[in-house]
């Protein structure tokens, strides 16, 4: 267990950056920061959780930007950002620092937020080391910060996995070695016997290997199947693996902020009330009370004090804190070439000519729901429709009465007569056929087209 600490030194335009604020003349505002820690050095998806923890800073002092003045370093929130970690410090991690700007003017729906800068660093860092300084550029902005990881007693080591006992917790008892001087600090860890389990063993003298409760063997590798020592306190015996009575780690209740203490093998554990974290419940974590959900997001707390909050985002926003506006037009919701407009509260589609509907889904030129009059049939094609009209009718929807003889359909001087079912041609002498198209030869045989395959001359023939 331990705490990752981040100190922001300055945030402002970098060298060669914008000479004046890119957010000028927009009224009073203030800065705050969000830090997110992810384990490992691999590039993680932006939406992957901050598995090592996250923290939100307090809001900084209110400032009003001057339109013509050069943008100075902006006023920062006070204090460290602290991200408690319960388990081992991984050593390699991704650090994401977001700088947010909160506008305090008259905003619809309350304050408005905008993400000014986000820096991501993949780093190796040992716990217990000195502060590491960094300068990062994000667009025109420059962020200067320092960070470190520190263990919380009794955890020590570069990964905060070794446990030691503060000397002041030592009490002499019959048969135990003389007490070390009373000092509220850990003894320098002695070099244990080679191979002594880092997890289940410890030593108070160089070369020894003493086991935590539940483990035995020369290197503390063997689990104790049945322990008759449960409930006893003190360092374990090298011979039996049992604990010698001693002081309780919960004596004096080391848990702050109303945390309750329970003993664990060789140490203690604090059960913290909601909103507090850390080995001794001394670190306040991000909870719904911190207002971590932006843009109208609703903060939904977990079912128990240890579970993280989640933000349910209003339509149009996403991200773990509802900080990202959804580009809803990127999903191309408008069909048939319609133009998408994201109005914030709703999407609008501006449809091309010939299309309609909320998503331009209705083709005004198609046959669906469109009837051709007077027995005509609708034929689709090429994004448009046309009516194939019954004889005697014409026009776009077959609503116009047509004169079937207007196009002079009878060939070779034939006379055209309009009839209820169409037209009839009265052919001039020497011609025959529905349209008087076939000349009659002198021998009385008409010049009909060749018979289709399979028909013998003289069979009855029908022609359209």
């Amino acid at each position: 267990a331990g705490v990752f600490e981040l100190q922001i030194h300055s945030f402002g335009p970098g060298p060669g950056g914008a000479p004046r604020s890119p957010y000028s003349a927009r009224g009073p505002c203030r800065l705050f920061f969000r830090v997110c820690l992810k384990p490992g050095l691999s590039e993680e998806a932006a939406e992957s959780p901050c598995a090592l923890g996250a923290a939100l800073s307090a809001r900084g002092p209110v400032y009003t930007e001057q339109p013509e003045a050069p943008a100075p370093d902006l006023p920062l929130p006070n204090g460290l950002l602290q991200v408690p970690f319960r388990d081992a410090w991984p050593g390699t991690f991704s650090l994401i620092i977001e700088t947010w700007r909160e506008e305090l003017g008259d905003q619809i729906g309350g304050p408005a937020w905008s993400l000014l800068a986000r820096v991501t660093r993949r780093r190796r860092l040992a716990a217990g080391g000195p502060w590491a300084g960094d300068i990062q550029r994000a667009g025109a902005w420059e962020l200067r910060f320092s960070y470190r990881a520190r263990c919380e007693l009794p955890a020590v080591g570069t990964a905060c996995t070794r446990l030691c006992r503060p000397r002041s917790a030592s009490r002499c008892g019959p048969g135990l070695r003389p007490c070390a001087p009373l000092e509220d600090e850990c003894e320098a860890p002695p070099v244990c016997r080679a191979g002594c389990s880092l997890e289940h063993g410890f030593c108070e003298q160089p070369g020894e290997c003493r086991c935590l409760e539940g483990w035995t063997g020369p290197l503390c590798m063997v689990p104790v199947s049945t322990s008759s020592c449960l409930g006893l306190r003190g360092p374990s015996s090298t011979t039996t693996g049992c604990l010698v009575p001693g002081p309780g780690p919960c004596d004096g209740n080391p848990c702050a902020n109303g945390g309750s203490c329970s003993e664990t093998p060789g140490s203690f554990e604090c059960t913290c009330p909601r909103g507090f974290y850390g080995l001794r419940c001394e670190v306040s974590g991000v909870t719904c009370a911190d207002g971590p959900c932006f843009n109208g997001g609703l903060c939904v707390g977990g079912a128990d004090p240890d579970s993280a909050y989640i933000c349910h985002c209003p339509p149009g926003f996403q991200g773990s804190n509802c900080e990202k506006r959804v580009d809803r037009c990127s999903l191309q919701p408008c069909r048939n070439g319609g133009l998408c407009l994201d109005l914030g509260h709703a999407l609008r589609c501006r449809c091309r000519a010939g299309f309609a509907g909320p998503r331009c889904e209705h083709d005004l030129n198609d046959c669906a729901g469109r009837a051709c009059a007077n027995g005509g049939t609708c034929v689709e094609g090429g994004g448009a429709h046309r009516c194939s009209c019954a004889l005697g009718f014409g026009g776009r929807d077959c609503r116009e009465r047509a004169d079937p003889c207007a196009a002079r359909p009878c060939a070779h001087g034939g006379r055209c007569y309009a009839h209820f079912s169409g037209l009839v041609c009265a052919c001039a002498p020497g011609y025959m056929g529905a349209r008087c198209e076939f000349p009659v030869h002198p021998d009385g045989v008409s010049a009909l087209p060749a018979a289709p395959p399979g028909l013998r001359p003289g069979d009855p023939q029908r022609y359209p």
Epitope: D106, Q107, I108, G109, G110, P111, C288, A289, D290, G291, P292, C293, F294, N295, G296, G297, L298, C299, V300, G301, H312, P314, P315, G316, G344, H345, A346, L347, P358
Partner: antibody, heavy 118, light 108 residues
């Protein structure tokens, strides 16, 4: 203009399940959160829960063990089921749409009175 | 959960007077995520204000909201006859969503 209409039995027996449906007209059920709120006679408003068109739900912890809200996008409807009802569940039940700028209620149904009695 | 306490329980005023309704939260309401509703007998509530101070569509400008943190106010600058009703506040920053107990504005 979005309109919401609650429907369902006005009388439910104790220990049974109360079932109500809200039909949304004048707009799509997609892209919004939809909620149920109730008001016992002569008393104040109590939020029951909501559902997002994607299926996300959130319920009032005081009712969570008994509440289910579901969605039927094809019918533009969402529903409330409240199990093991008692006389204390007698109330006017409202369905409502949650706003675009936060979790307030911008459109409401006219409400339906459900009486729990044997 | 965040408990909202409205005061007074009943406000007796005459048309034309100014009404000031209070809503106090048991803990800070994040980012002024607070709404006000009006409810008349036999009707559903109607949204008046969201974001503590933004008027909903179609709401007359005699209605105004203010406040932040734990203290919020709804003001009706000049009461019209149709304004006599029950008014509720609601916070929507932290789940569960909660309403105040209501303030009844009645004709004196």
């Amino acid at each position: 203009q979005v309109q919401l209409q609650e429907s369902g039995p006005g009388l439910v027996k104790p220990s049974e399940t109360l079932s109500l449906t809200c039909t949304v007209s004048g707009g799509s059920i997609n892209s919004y959160y939809w909620s149920w709120i109730r008001q016992p006679p002569g008393k104040g408003l109590e939020w029951i829960g909501y559902i997002f068109y994607s299926g996300i739900t959130n319920y009032n912890p005081s009712l969570k063990s008994r509440v289910t809200i579901s969605l039927d996008t094809s019918k533009n409807q969402f529903s409330l089921k409240l199990s093991s009802v008692t006389a204390a569940d007698t109330a006017v039940y409202y369905c409502a749409r949650i706003g675009v700028a936060g979790f307030y209620f911008d459109y409401w149904g006219q409400g339906t009175l459900v009486t729990v009695s044997s | 959960e965040i408990v909202l306490t409205q005061s007074p329980g009943t406000l007796s005023l005459s048309p034309g007077e100014r009404a000031t309704l209070s809503c106090r939260a048991s803990q800070s309401v994040s980012s002024s995520y607070l709404a006000w509703y009006q409810q008349k007998p036999g009707q559903a509530p109607r949204l008046l204000i969201y974001g503590a101070s933004s008027r909903a569509t179609g709401i007359p400008d005699r209605f105004s909201g203010s406040g932040s943190g734990t203290d919020f106010t709804l003001t009706i600058s000049r009461l019209e006859p149709e304004d006599f009703a029950v008014y509720y506040c609601q916070q929507y920053g932290t789940s569960p969503l909660t309403f105040g107990g209501g303030t009844k504005v009645e004709i004196k």
